[in-house]
């Protein structure tokens, strides 16, 4: 728990607990904000960010988008709070330890956003989840 | 057990440099990926910066990047926070604190063993 030395401030963000009174952690997360980036057509990817940084909030997580265009390729890695919207989208998937990418409807371009709560989880970004056991391929594997 | 106490605080003119220690008792010091936090008057904690205790990966917040390295002596049990170019706005208590070894570092483990923290007043 939070020691009697260390002051708690009313309304202060900076300092979350959870149930039992023990400080949260901040999220360590890629971030390298918008990037041109070769991946494309694959089932996962690297960030090919060298850049970990404490997320500025415990209740922080990491975010990854990908967006591709006529143009171009870019991948973005923030930390951003799962509260707020990003890029107009509600972070669903905030508690997962893995970057599922999604596909969102935005006109003009392919957009992917993933979002996960494990240190450095927005470094391997996954179109295709392999082991989602409701893939029937793999129960067929499983059970043979 | 593991106990923390900080040292190396004081006063400091804008631009200047200090290095703040933590030394840890305790034969566990090892097994813990290390912080500095602070907490400026008034307002909330800010961590600032952490190191791993193998290979002593470290990790920044953008506020003090390139300003500050972490450091750790595992034979000595010390945590170090060298502090340079430093601003009126790194005005704060400094605290150093353990994160216990959970599942890939549990984010919800208590802070159990706090120092009573080091003053660093940036002013001139």
């Known amino acids: 728990t939070i020691p009697p030395h260390v002051q708690k401030s009313v309304n202060n963000d900076m300092i979350v607990t959870d149930n039992n009174g023990a400080v949260k952690f901040p999220q360590l997360c890629k971030f390298c904000d918008v990037r041109f980036s070769t991946c494309d057509n694959q089932k996962s990817c690297m960030s090919n960010c060298s850049i970990t940084s404490i997320c500025e909030k415990p209740q922080e997580v990491c975010v990854a988008v990908w967006r591709k265009n006529d143009e171009n390729i870019t991948l973005e890695t923030v930390c951003h709070d799962p509260k707020l919207p990003y890029h107009d989208f509600i972070l669903e998937d905030a508690a997962s330890p893995k970057c599922i990418m999604k596909e969102k409807k935005k006109p003009g371009e392919t957009f992917f956003m993933c979002s996960c709560s494990s240190d450095e989880c927005n470094d391997n970004i996954i179109f295709s989840e392999e082991y989602n056991t409701s893939n029937p391929d793999l129960l067929l594997v499983i059970f043979q | 057990e593991v106990q923390l106490l900080e040292s190396g605080g004081g006063l400091v003119q804008p631009g200047g440099s200090l290095r703040l220690s933590c030394a840890a008792s305790?034969?566990?010091?090892?097994?813990?990926r290390m912080w500095w936090v602070r907490q400026a008057p008034g307002k909330g904690l800010e961590w600032v910066s952490?190191?791993?205790?193998?290979?002593?990966?470290?990790y920044y917040a953008n506020s003090v990047k390139g300003r500050f390295t972490i450091s750790r002596d595992n034979s000595k049990n010390t945590l170090y926070l060298q502090m340079n170019s430093l601003r009126a706005e790194d005005t704060a208590v400094y605290y150093c604190?353990?994160?216990?070894?959970?599942?890939?570092?549990?984010?919800?483990?208590?802070?159990?063993?706090w120092g009573q923290g080091t003053l660093v007043t940036v002013s001139s």
């Open positions: 604190a353990k994160q216990a070894p959970g599942e890939k570092w549990a984010r919800r483990w208590d802070l159990d063993y």
């Open positions: 952490a190191i791993e205790p193998i290979g002593h990966r470290t």
């Open positions: 305790g034969s566990t010091f090892t097994e813990y």
